[in-house]
């Protein structure tokens, strides 16, 4: 991360703002995406009854959505900065195919869906800068992603609605866990 400059010596009428630290920038970016997810979830919940479905019913899906586990080192017990940072970046890279799937799933929130996708790419860049010495980050295979996308888009309407809801819920949970973990770094 860039080193914040020292205090400005000359006295001026308007206060000077220091540049954001790498952590502040990442924090703001995650909150930006979370606010976008909230808008998308609102449209999804208004459109279908997926949001009322029990967690158990929704759990019976074959989506392999990234999820934080104890071994990832992102929880307070057993916290490990390096392991956790790798997990966050890897998880976000894995979510990208699902965010691509969301692009044609919204009517009134089309811009938000695009913004969430784009700002996730930006967040990945911010985090990769923070983790520039970590080489354990694996990028998903483009061919696998392409066939997954085709498969998801071929589902019937009900399954597509459920998939959309699950992606948004999982992504929100993943980002919230990431935000908590990053604040400890």
């Amino acid at each position: 991360a860039p080193v914040p400059p020292g205090e400005d010596s000359k006295d001026v009428a308007a206060p000077h703002r220091q540049p954001l630290t790498s952590s502040e920038r990442i924090d703001k970016q995650i909150r930006y995406i979370l606010d976008g997810i909230s808008a998308l979830r609102k449209e999804t919940c208004n459109k279908s009854n997926m949001c009322e479905s029990s967690k158990e019913a929704l759990a019976e899906n074959n989506l392999n959505l990234p999820k934080m586990a104890e071994k990832d080192g992102c929880f307070q017990s057993g916290f490990n900065e390096e392991t956790c940072l790798v997990k966050i970046i890897t998880g976000l890279l894995e979510f990208e195919v699902y965010l691509e799937y969301l692009q044609n799933r919204f009517e009134s929130s089309e811009e938000q869906a695009r913004a969430v996708q784009m700002s996730t790419k930006v967040l990945i860049q911010f985090l990769q800068k923070k983790a520039k010495n970590l080489d354990a980050i694996t990028t998903p295979d483009p061919t696998t992603n392409a066939s997954l996308l085709t498969k998801l888009q071929a589902q019937n309407q009900w399954l597509q609605d459920m998939t959309t809801h699950l992606i948004l819920r999982s992504f929100k949970e993943f980002l919230q866990s990431s935000l908590r973990a990053l604040r400890q770094m």
Epitope: P2, P5, Y32, D35
Partner: antibody, heavy 115, light 107 residues
């Protein structure tokens, strides 16, 4: 994808006032925001910025005391109140998300100060 | 205030050319520098931040370099859509300041 939409521009006499609005999508609620202006045929000039809560504002010296930036997060709207306008304030005014650099911009609204 | 000086102020080039635009700060700004592209009647678009980080979906032909006071934006092989005005901006301290712009025209 227009996430930021400015309005309120127009023709105003020197010494007059105008309030610009920037309607933002919900994504901007927790973001620092800036106003940047561009005089016709000229370069970009930062006007000022505001923190997410609206508690901190920063201004360029040439608008300090005349312009006020505020926001209403319940309406997802950013404002620029411009008083004591001068001919040199004639410009297209843009609102932008401010991560120190500006990564999302509105389409701009033209303010003309002339008698 | 930190002054940002861009050169050249205008430049004629052909499709396929390699083009370099420079930006000089009146004092050291570490790598707190961004580059924007602006087309007539449109808002600026972010290309590069932190001196050399390409914003997502910006074509790889655009690259930034430099630190301290001297920075460059390079377009490795000009495409027809690259003819526009380019601005640098420092964010080391407020007031944020921009270069005066470089207008890139077709030769």
């Amino acid at each position: 994808y227009p996430q930021l939409v400015e309005s309120g521009g127009g023709l105003v006499q020197p010494g007059g006032s105008l309030r610009l609005s920037c309607e933002a999508s919900v994504l901007f609620k927790h973001q620092d925001m800036s106003w940047v202006r561009q005089a016709p045929g000229k370069g970009l000039e930062w006007v000022g910025s505001i923190s997410p809560s609206g508690g901190s504002t920063y201004y360029n010296d040439n608008v300090l005391g005349r312009f006020t930036i505020s926001r209403d997060n319940s309406k997802n709207t950013l404002y620029l109140q411009m008083n004591s306008l001068r001919a040199e304030d004639t410009a297209v005014y843009y609102c932008a998300r401010d991560l120190d650099f500006m990564d999302e911009w509105g389409q701009g609204t033209l303010v003309t100060v002339s008698s | 205030d930190i002054q940002m000086t861009q050169s050249p102020s205008s430049l004629s080039a052909s499709v396929g050319d390699r083009v370099t635009i420079t930006c000089r700060a009146s004092q050291g700004i570490s790598n707190y520098l961004a580059w924007y592209q602006q087309k007539p009647g449109k808002a600026p678009k972010l290309l590069i931040y932190d001196g050399d980080d390409r914003y997502p979906e910006v074509p790889s032909r655009f690259s930034g370099s430099g630190s301290g006071t001297d920075f460059t934006l390079t377009i490795s092989s000009l495409q027809p859509e690259d003819f526009a005005t380019y601005y640098c901006q420092q964010y080391y301290s407020t007031p944020y300041t921009f270069g005066q712009g470089t207008k890139l025209e077709i030769k």
